[in-house]
């Protein structure tokens, strides 16, 4: 196994993960792509807690550089033994891992929280509020509950989507950050096991 | 004062079809949820369908689908359900009522008969 | 669609008596439940909306209770504009649904 190689393929995954999050957050502020709501104020509150561009994007890209650049084969030594810097530097990783592990917590509580709760919207009673908070998240089972809201259009479909897009991306973010606790325990206590001929693909 | 002022009653042909208007007054017309409600002589009360007339977000009761036809007009503050191939059981009393910040606000109703 | 039944279908009461009109519903619909009262050739008239929430220029007398399927109106000391018929509704989603009316007249 090559801690290093793998430590290197989870810091791609998690660019790519982060930058996810960050587009789904972003839209949650354009429902139906308009931007009246946002300047309205008339978005959930779990909207402003920025989950997916600073939970699941922005903190996560501090672990995932920190995974790609362990693959570097400039690492300085220690004693004469190359390796011994390496297994501090894999050591050190499990350290971004564990605020990896606290950005995509975030950001899948956070999402859990705005599914359950449900979209800010106008009802069919002509009121703004949150019409779905007292159903438990019960009515992400019905559908036909859905047309409650009607403004803006689809906002129920919209959030129900981007905040399940948030759910999943910071879940195998977390999966992610927390094998890269273990790869880096593993890698910091067996040392870089692969030599530079050895090439395996992550 | 808030209030929906209905179109007055109808009579017509089996075959053809009806347009009823719905004017409403005394608050902003496109933050209110226009409902439309059906009631023949001595019965209960049957929903057809709703128009927000901000965005018009449409949404009818399947029983009425193709029956019935919402449509609104913001510039002159007024929403229309218009009723096609009309038949004895579309004789009724047909409600608008505007739900907003102020409640419920409902129109006296027009009266559609449908008679040979 | 959901269901609604209302109970009784009628009943007679004096000025100053209290009463309880209840509704039962198909489906689990929360607290999304309203109630209305209509004069005979009137428009009928919101008076609760969410179960419990008193409609503008409603009087205190009138109070909604219940959650789930079961929901209840009560009117304590009846006055002689309370008669006529009530209506109960559900705005759980669409289509709204109403029961079949509960008639109050005067004994």
């Known amino acids: 196994m090559c801690y290093g190689k793998c430590a290197r393929c989870i810091g791609h995954s998690l660019v790519g993960l982060a930058l996810l999050c960050i587009i789904a957050n972003i839209l949650l502020y354009f429902p139906n792509g308009e931007t009246k709501y946002a300047s309205e104020n008339h978005l959930s509150r779990f909207v402003w807690f920025f989950s997916g561009i600073v939970g699941g994007g922005l903190l996560m890209l501090l672990p995932a550089f920190v995974f790609i650049g362990l693959e570097q084969d400039d690492c300085c030594g220690c004693c004469g033994h190359e390796n011994c810097g390496k297994r501090c530097a894999m050591l050190s990783s499990v350290l971004a891992a564990l605020i990896g592990i606290a950005g995509s917590g975030y950001c899948v509580i956070v999402a859990a929280l705005g599914l359950a709760e449900g979209p800010l919207c106008l009802d069919s009673f002509g009121q703004w509020n949150y019409t779905f908070a007292s159903t438990e998240g019960q009515y992400l089972l019905d559908t036909s509950t859905w047309s409650q809201c009607t403004e803006p259009k689809h906002i129920v479909e919209w959030n129900v989507s981007l905040f399940s897009i948030l759910l999943a991306l910071g879940g195998i973010e977390f999966i992610l950050c927390l094998i890269q606790v273990i790869n880096g325990v593993l890698g910091g206590i067996c040392g870089f096991c692969c030599s530079r001929q050895q090439q395996y693909d992550c | 004062e808030v209030q929906v002022q209905q179109s007055g009653p109808e009579l017509v042909k089996p075959g053809a079809s009806v347009k009823m208007s719905c004017k409403a007054s005394g608050y902003t017309f496109t933050s209110y949820v226009m409902h439309w409600v059906k009631q023949k002589p001595g019965q209960g009360l049957e929903w057809i369908g709703y128009i927000n007339p901000n965005n018009d977000n449409i949404n009818y009761n399947e029983k009425f689908k193709g029956k019935a036809s919402l449509t609104s007009d913001k510039s002159s503050n007024t929403v229309y359900m218009e009723l096609s191939s009309l038949t004895s059981e579309d004789s009724a009393v047909y409600y608008c009522?505007?739900?907003?910040?102020?409640?419920?606000?409902w129109g006296q109703g027009t009266l559609v008969t449908v008679s040979a | 669609d959901i269901q609604m039944t209302q109970s009784p279908a009628s009943l007679s009461a004096s000025v100053g008596e209290t009463v309880t009109i209840t509704c039962r519903t198909s489906k689990n619909i929360f607290n999304f439940l309203a109630w209305y009262h209509q004069k005979q050739g009137r428009s009928p008239r919101l008076l609760v909306s969410h179960t419990k929430t008193l409609a503008a220029g409603v009087p205190s007398r009138f109070s909604g209770s219940g959650s789930g399927t079961q929901f209840s109106l009560k009117i304590n000391s009846l006055q002689p504009e309370d008669f006529g018929i009530y209506y109960c509704?559900?705005?759980?989603?669409?289509?709204?649904?109403f029961g079949g009316g509960t008639k109050l007249e005067i004994k």
């Open positions: 009522a505007g739900y907003g910040n102020s409640g419920a606000n």
């Open positions: 509704q559900h705005h759980y989603g669409t289509p709204w649904t």
